[in-house]
């Protein structure tokens, strides 16, 4: 009878084991072991027992002891079970950002590991077990589906293998994959709200505000604001689940035309964009042209108003005929026209909005001098010793210089309060002089003597 010891062995892959083959007869003709494993016989006294060192055991094996005794041949097997932990424990790659509400499939792949009957695959969120399954197939694959929630943000998902050899008197061997950190996000289906001027004048500044509610995590949202090809640098303020991005836009003549204003919000692997059209226009104030800004009375004056080619103008309230960017009027300058304002109003339609610009010019009419009865009476009669103020106003542009003299020497104190005396009586020659010429007028002062009764 042949026997083997031990009859069952569990050993690490690549390990060695001592196997004793024994026989019940004293003088066996033959005693040995049959195995593909490298073996080394250890010398022992006696003929009915042999000890072999079997080395580099890579896989499960069943070495067989045999003996040949007078009463016949017999065999006995020992069962070598090799254990080893998996060579690869990996979670299938996933995008790090996942939208809330999406079903996320976690897939763990396990390569190697034995004995498979003792090998379990566990999928975890943090330390919480999501799924536990025996390792089946090569590679073994275990999957589970997770409904992504907001509170999963930042959670670590991993896969662990457990090789449980405790029933065999060994320990529990664990291998864990690299963790997958989940970043969850919510980007609403509504596009961002964009507030900006619809029209903007060249060489001015405007403010653009882009905002969106219902974002998570709001601090991770990227905001891109652009006007045409110009990147805008917004100042972003964050709320609990909202942001507001404010940018100042300066436009120059280079920007004239229709530009696309875009606000793009990028969160996770998704984006939302809002597009708006901004018309940048150049509209200088209309030009009011006078033939000459200063003319003499009686001169023909042409007043022209010229504006942007697409504008419509009115000159002193009168629309251009035909309606367009130019208007003019003709007049013969009168003293009443001195200081008269000629106002040109231009209206330009830009993207459905009416823009108004005004320009005013003043006409100076040179005339005079004038001395008339109303402003310079020809006769004054005053009681002697009374207080009087002689008045004589000369008109003209430029304002004339006025002198009233009696006998070419004695002045009448125009505009001054005087005590009427006999000396004041007489005829004065009032002379008004300016660059436009000279006029004279006679003024008589009569002094009434008091009656003595």
């Amino acid at each position: 009878q042949t026997s083997v010891s031990p009859s069952k062995v569990i050993l690490p892959r690549g390990g060695s084991v001592l196997v004793t083959c024994s026989t019940s007869c004293d003088q066996p003709k033959l005693l040995g072991i049959e195995t593909p494993l490298p073996k080394k016989e250890l010398l022992l006294p006696g003929n009915n027992r042999k000890v072999y060192e079997l080395s580099n055991v890579q896989e499960d094996s069943q070495p067989m002891c045999y003996s040949n005794c007078p009463d016949g041949q017999s065999t006995a097997k020992t069962f070598l079970t090799v254990y080893w932990t998996p060579e690869r424990v990996e979670l299938a790659p996933l995008p790090s950002w996942q939208p809330v509400g999406k079903n996320l499939t976690l897939r763990c792949q396990v390569e190697g590991g034995a004995p498979r009957a003792n090998l379990t695959v566990v999928l975890l969120r943090g330390e919480k077990e999501l799924k536990r399954e025996p390792a089946v197939g090569e590679p073994a694959e275990v999957t589970t589906t997770v409904l992504v929630r907001r509170d999963h943000h930042g959670a670590n998902f991993s896969c662990r293998t457990e090789l449980d050899l405790r029933p065999q008197g060994l320990e529990l061997f664990e291998n864990t994959s690299a963790p997958y950190q989940l970043q969850t996000f919510v980007l609403p289906a509504t596009p961002p709200q964009l507030v900006s001027p619809r029209v903007l004048e060249v060489d001015t500044q405007g403010t653009v505000v882009c905002s969106l509610d219902g974002l998570f995590p709001v601090s991770e949202a990227q905001v891109h604001l652009a006007l045409g090809d110009q990147r805008l640098n917004p100042t972003v303020t964050y709320g609990n689940d909202s942001f507001s991005a404010k940018a100042s836009v300066s436009v120059t003549a280079e920007d004239e035309g229709t530009q696309r204003l875009t606000c793009a919000v990028i969160l996770g692997n998704q984006s939302q964009e809002t597009l708006q059209t901004v018309t940048i226009y150049s509209f200088p104030a209309p030009n009011v042209i006078l033939t000459k800004p200063e003319v003499s009375e009686g001169t023909e004056v042409t007043v022209k108003c010229e504006a942007h080619p697409r504008a419509k103008v009115t000159l002193n309230g009168v629309p251009a005929q035909p309606l367009g960017p130019r208007a003019q009027l003709l007049l013969k300058a009168t003293p009443e026209d001195n200081g008269r304002s000629f106002s040109c109003s231009a209206t330009l339609e830009v993207a459905g909005q009416l823009i108004h610009k005004n320009q005013t010019r003043e006409l100076r009419v040179l005339y005079g001098p004038r001395l008339d009865e109303r402003d310079c009476p020809g006769n004054w009669t005053w009681p002697e010793n009374s207080q009087q103020t002689p008045m004589c106003q000369a008109w003209g542009n430029p304002l004339p210089e006025l002198k009233c003299l009696k006998d070419g020497t004695f002045p009448l104190p125009i505009g001054e309060s005087v005590t009427v005396t006999r000396d004041l009586e007489g005829t004065y020659l009032c002379r008004a002089r300016s660059t436009q010429g000279e006029v004279t007028r006679k003024v008589t002062v009569n002094v009434l003597s008091p009656r003595y009764e």
Epitope: Q230, R231, A253, E254, E256, T262, S282
Partner: antibody, heavy 119, light 110 residues
Framework: QVQLQESGGGLVQLGGSLRLSCAAS????????MSWVRQAPGKGLEWVSA????????YYADSVKGRFTISRDNSKNTLYLQMSSLRAEDTAFYYC????????????WGHGTLVTVSS | SSELTQDPAVSVALGQTVKITCQGD??????ASWYQQRPGQAPVLVIY???SRPSGIPDRFSGSSSGNTASLTITGAQAEDEADYYC????????????FGGGTKLTVLR
Amino acid sequence: QVQLQESGGGLVQLGGSLRLSCAASGFTFSSYAMSWVRQAPGKGLEWVSAISGSGGSTYYADSVKGRFTISRDNSKNTLYLQMSSLRAEDTAFYYCANSAYTGGWYDYWGHGTLVTVSS
Amino acid sequence: SSELTQDPAVSVALGQTVKITCQGDSLRTYYASWYQQRPGQAPVLVIYGENSRPSGIPDRFSGSSSGNTASLTITGAQAEDEADYYCNSRDSSGNHLRVFGGGTKLTVLR
């Protein structure tokens, strides 16, 4: 559809003058800025000049400033480039292109017209 | 400086992805636009703004930018994509209105 057709190119003597035209159709001409871009044979693209939709603003590359004049006639939907004091290095295909705003990218291009300056 | 720098030549195997880059100071302020020019033809706009395509341009063309570099990516290059590609931007130095890169000759290897 948008069409831009350049004309007026040809052989011109060194120091001579030439006027290029670009006839536009298929879009509101006065609402678009227009540009001239040139390409010397076998070489890259070079921006030459641009004009705003209203014609009120004009821009020139340093290499042509003082010699070339860009203009437009919105009533005729036509862009012009008056070239004078022409040099050998002005030899190129001249393309007209439109953009939604003066400094903007070029949405559409013409097929080009060749200007050859000979000595 | 008002220069935009491009690699003179790039090649790609048919169906593979290729990235053409453009560098310049103005790209920190302005987005680049990209033009395709086939031999003997006028340039055609393929990308503008941050990453916008005009109608009729296949979605294998995309644009991106970072710092002073703009990139044009062709995902799954086709034989008909063999052409010269030019980047173009507004000139932040103020000397010119717009500037072009020197161009990149793209060869599609069959």
